[in-house]
């Protein structure tokens, strides 16, 4: 069992996969969120709105994701366990202005494999 | 099962993979969420809306993901477990204004391999 006192937990496990959660302010209307592993972009989700308020969500890397009004969660099914890696989210805010781009806090993920369990140590 | 006192769990395991959840405010209508491992972008999901309120989701890195109205979850199927890594989400908020980009809270994920189980230790 894993306990923590933080308001937000970036990593969680579901059905053998890792869910990485990238939070953003609820006031944000249009944005791009990218998930990095080290320097590699694993997932990218862009939400924009058109002139009639229709929402366009682009997921060019075909990541499994869950989008809410204050976070984007990416689901990685078989994370590479050969070595630990640092994951972080990068946020581009298009709306409301002004345009902003920032790296969100991240975490180091190391998965120890076995047939029965995977032990995750998460330091925030 | 992984429990904690946090309002949001970032990591969880599903079917041998890791789900990393990136939360964002429910008021956010259009956004991009990126998941980083260290400085590498693993996933990026973008949600936008058109003028008739139709939603477009872009997932350029083809990550497995789940999108809700306040989070995006990415599923990593084989996270590298040779060493621990820091994961975090980066959020770009396009709508509502002003545009914002920020790194969300992250976590250190270390997976210990064995033949029997995958145990997750999470320090928040």
């Amino acid at each position: 069992e894993i306990n923590g006192s933080a308001d937000h937990r970036m990593f969680s496990f579901h059905n053998g996969g890792v869910q990485i959660s990238c939070k953003y302010p609820e006031t944000v209307q249009q944005l791009k969120m990218r998930l990095f592993r080290e320097r590699e972009v694993l997932c990218e989700l862009t939400k924009t709105k058109g002139s009639g308020n229709a929402v366009s969500i682009k997921n060019p890397m075909l990541c499994l994701y869950h989008l809410s009004n204050n976070s984007v969660s990416f689901f990685l099914n078989n994370p590479d366990s050969s070595q630990g890696s640092y994951y972080f989210c990068s946020l581009s805010i298009f709306d409301p202005p002004p345009f902003q781009e920032r790296n969100l806090s991240g975490g180091y993920l190391h998965i120890y494999e076995s047939q029965l369990c995977c032990q995750l140590k998460l330091w925030l | 099962e992984i429990n904690g006192s946090a309002d949001h769990r970032m990591f969880s395991f599903h079917n041998g993979g890791v789900q990393i959840s990136c939360k964002y405010p429910e008021t956010v209508q259009q956004l991009k969420m990126r998941l980083f491992r260290e400085r590498e972008v693993l996933c990026e999901l973008t949600k936008t809306k058109g003028s008739g309120n139709a939603v477009s989701i872009k997932n350029p890195m083809l990550c497995l993901y789940h999108l809700s109205n306040n989070s995006v979850s990415f599923f990593l199927n084989n996270p590298d477990s040779s060493q621990g890594s820091y994961y975090f989400c980066s959020l770009s908020i396009f709508d509502p204004p002003p545009f914002q980009e920020r790194n969300l809270s992250g976590g250190y994920l270390h997976i210990y391999e064995s033949q029997l189980c995958c145990q997750l230790k999470l320090w928040l």
């Epitope: 058109g50 002139s51 308020n53 229709a54 682009k58 709306d95 409301p96 | 058109g50 003028s51 139709a54």
Partner: antibody
């Protein structure tokens, strides 16, 4: 500098067709929704259609739905409007516009379409 | 469809004086904390130019004599001190839903 240049307008008979083009430059075209807005001579502005960043979402004004088709070629940085079954009331200056997240922040100079016999 | 109306149809104001244009929508444009209402300026022979978005936020480069206010269904564009270059037609526009619609425009001249 953002530039939008329309072309393809002209005189056409009722029932005829035209294809408008809009060449975009000075910005990452594939990052933006794009729209067509028209203005009849001496009249106000009327929204016609829009398209999302990769062309997967398109929307139309009730006045043109079923007759007009919006499309884009991101490799060519070009927006299109195929207009079929044209009517006299479609006569207008057609503007290509960039939807800048919360408003039409860039406009072309427009191309005049005249539908008359 | 949401119907946008503007008043007056036209107005003439002396240089340096205040000009006020009203816009009314047939239903509320408020969603969350944002009003999906924009204002455009169109000078003779030119395409429109974005002035104000989200009812009250000036677009980049717009002089501070232009201001927007209002919420819900009633909105106002104010030019605090009219300049010669402000002669134009001003349109309100909503992007609350589809189809987005414009008001009929208000023509501003110098008295």
């Amino acid at each position: 500098e953002v530039q939008l240049v329309e072309s393809g307008g002209g005189l056409v008979q009722p029932g005829g067709s035209l294809r408008l083009s809009c060449a975009a430059s000075g910005f990452t075209f594939s990052d933006y929704w794009m729209d067509w807005v028209r203005q009849a001579p001496g009249k106000g502005l009327v929204w016609v259609s829009n398209i999302d960043e990769d062309g997967s979402i398109t929307e139309y004004s009730p006045f043109v739905k079923g007759r007009f088709t919006i499309s884009r070629d991101n490799a060519k940085n070009t927006l299109y409007l195929q207009m079929n079954s044209l009517r006299a009331e479609d006569t207008a200056v057609y503007y290509c516009t960039r939807w800048g997240r919360f408003g039409f922040d860039s406009w072309g100079q427009g191309t005049l379409v005249t539908v008359s016999s | 469809d949401i119907v946008m109306t503007q008043s007056p149809d036209s107005l003439a104001v002396s240089l340096g004086e205040r000009a006020t244009i009203n816009c009314k929508s047939s239903q509320s444009l408020l969603s969350g904390s944002f009003n999906y209402l924009t204002w455009y300026q169109q000078k003779p022979g030119q395409p429109p130019k974005l002035l104000i978005f989200y009812a009250s936020t000036r677009h980049t480069g717009v002089p501070d004599r232009f201001s927007g206010s209002g919420s819900g269904t009633d909105f106002t564009l104010t030019i605090s001190s009219l300049q010669a270059e402000d002669v134009a037609v001003y349109y309100c526009h909503h992007h609350y839903n589809a189809p987005p619609t414009f008001g009929p425009g208000t023509k501003v001249d110098i008295k």
